[in-house]
Interface confidence: low
Amino acid sequence: YSIVTQITGPTTVNGLERGSLTVQCVYRSGWETYLKWWCRGAIWRDCKILVKTSGSEQEVKRDRVSIKDNQKNRTFTVTMEDLMKTDADTYWCGIEKTGNDLGVTVQVTIDPAPVTQEETSSSPTLTGHHLDNRHKLLKLS
């Protein structure tokens, strides 16, 4: 029974620059107590874990990424906020277990934010919207 699919997720997820995206990964019964993670990088063995659950349903947030496990529904949800073009990459929904972890790839693509009227005007004034994002980004450094 080694070929049984233990975890599934969307093949691709699309987000808007400066927006947020949500990925839902579904796992089979029996994995409720295991740690779930979200990692970045096309190569499975070398991907960088961005955020990991604590074994409970408590949401864990790290920088712009959060993860929350719903053990009853057997889904864990990853949210990426304040998206940047550079966030486009191959990611993995994963479950930590003895031996080899279980994982499924998710391709994340980022579309440029629609150009607003204020952005096309000659005035380079920073609007509140821009300031909010800038403050959030500054907090990350």
Epitope: S2, R28, S29
Partner: antibody, heavy 122, light 111 residues
Framework: EIQLQQSGAELVRPGTSVKVSCKAS????????IEWVKQRPGQGLEWIGV????????YYNEKFKGKTTLTADKSSSTAYMQLSSLAFDDSAVYFC???????????????WGQGTSVIVSS | DLVLTQSPASLAVSLGQRATISCRAS??????????MNWFQQKSGQPPKVLIY???NRGSGVPARFSGSGSGTDFSLNIHPMEEDDTAMYFC?????????FGGGTKLEIK
């Protein structure tokens, strides 16, 4: 030899708590889950919940949430089930059982403890 | 919760004859092409012992006279030929979804 050795029978008063232990030997404790099952005299089996000694994560049957706390001590390869606010209908035999943690393969509870009898009496 | 209904509640079978125990689930316990159904035997004063897992696979050291079949919602455990040592309670269990649930049990005796 794989063994799950449970603590002895308990006679307890209503409203108190009791902690049942399940000591594992003969295998790598953190590589398998420990499940807990309740059996009232002459009755069927009820699944209480499961703990993953590797991660410390636990999952409870909704019916036993608040009544039961599952923990595991890696250093002594022992799993524990605490029952709180004991009532007469908590009187039962409680079993711990090992189940395969590598769910890439189908599993069932393959090794069981001998059971711990808990009697709630005033 | 997923409910498992076992029948009959008790059964008396002559030595050498066939015993058949049924288990019906309130919804399908199949997933990924596998039936998540187990069968346990419990003798008096002892813990349960797994006989069959994934509907039809015998557990380690389980004699060939025990066999399981079925898929979806209907499952059965067959014991043939019946031996004296088979006097026990038998339970089905589903592990398709939590909380895992057991059938009410079937008491098997010698006729």
């Amino acid at each position: 030899e794989i063994q799950l050795q449970q603590s002895g029978a308990e006679l307890v008063r209503p409203g108190t708590s009791v902690k049942v232990s399940c000591k594992a030997s003969g295998y790598a404790f953190t590589n398998y889950l420990i499940e807990w099952v309740k059996q009232r005299p002459g009755q069927g089996l009820e699944w209480i919940g499961v703990i993953n000694p590797g991660s410390g994560g636990s999952y409870y049957n909704e019916k036993f949430k608040g009544k039961t706390t599952l923990t595991a001590d890696k250093s002594s390869s022992t799993a524990y089930m605490q029952l709180s606010s004991l009532a007469f209908d908590d009187s039962a035999v409680y079993f711990c059982a090992r189940s395969e943690s590598n769910y890439s393969y189908y599993y069932a509870m393959d090794y069981w403890g001998q059971g711990t009898s808990v009697i709630v009496s005033s | 919760d997923l409910v498992l209904t076992q029948s009959p509640a008790s059964l008396a079978v002559s030595l050498g004859q066939r015993a058949t125990i049924s288990c019906r689930a309130s919804e399908s316990v199949d997933n990924y092409g596998i039936s998540f159904m187990n069968w346990f035997q419990q003798k008096s004063g002892q813990p349960p012992k797994v006989l069959i897992y994934a509907a039809s696979n015998r557990g380690s050291g389980v004699p060939a006279r025990f066999s399981g079949s079925g898929s979806g919602t209907d499952f059965s455990l067959n014991i043939h030929p019946m031996e004296e040592d088979d006097t026990a309670m038998y339970f089905c269990q589903q592990t398709k979804e939590v909380p895992y649930t057991f059938g009410g049990g079937t008491k098997l005796e010698i006729k």
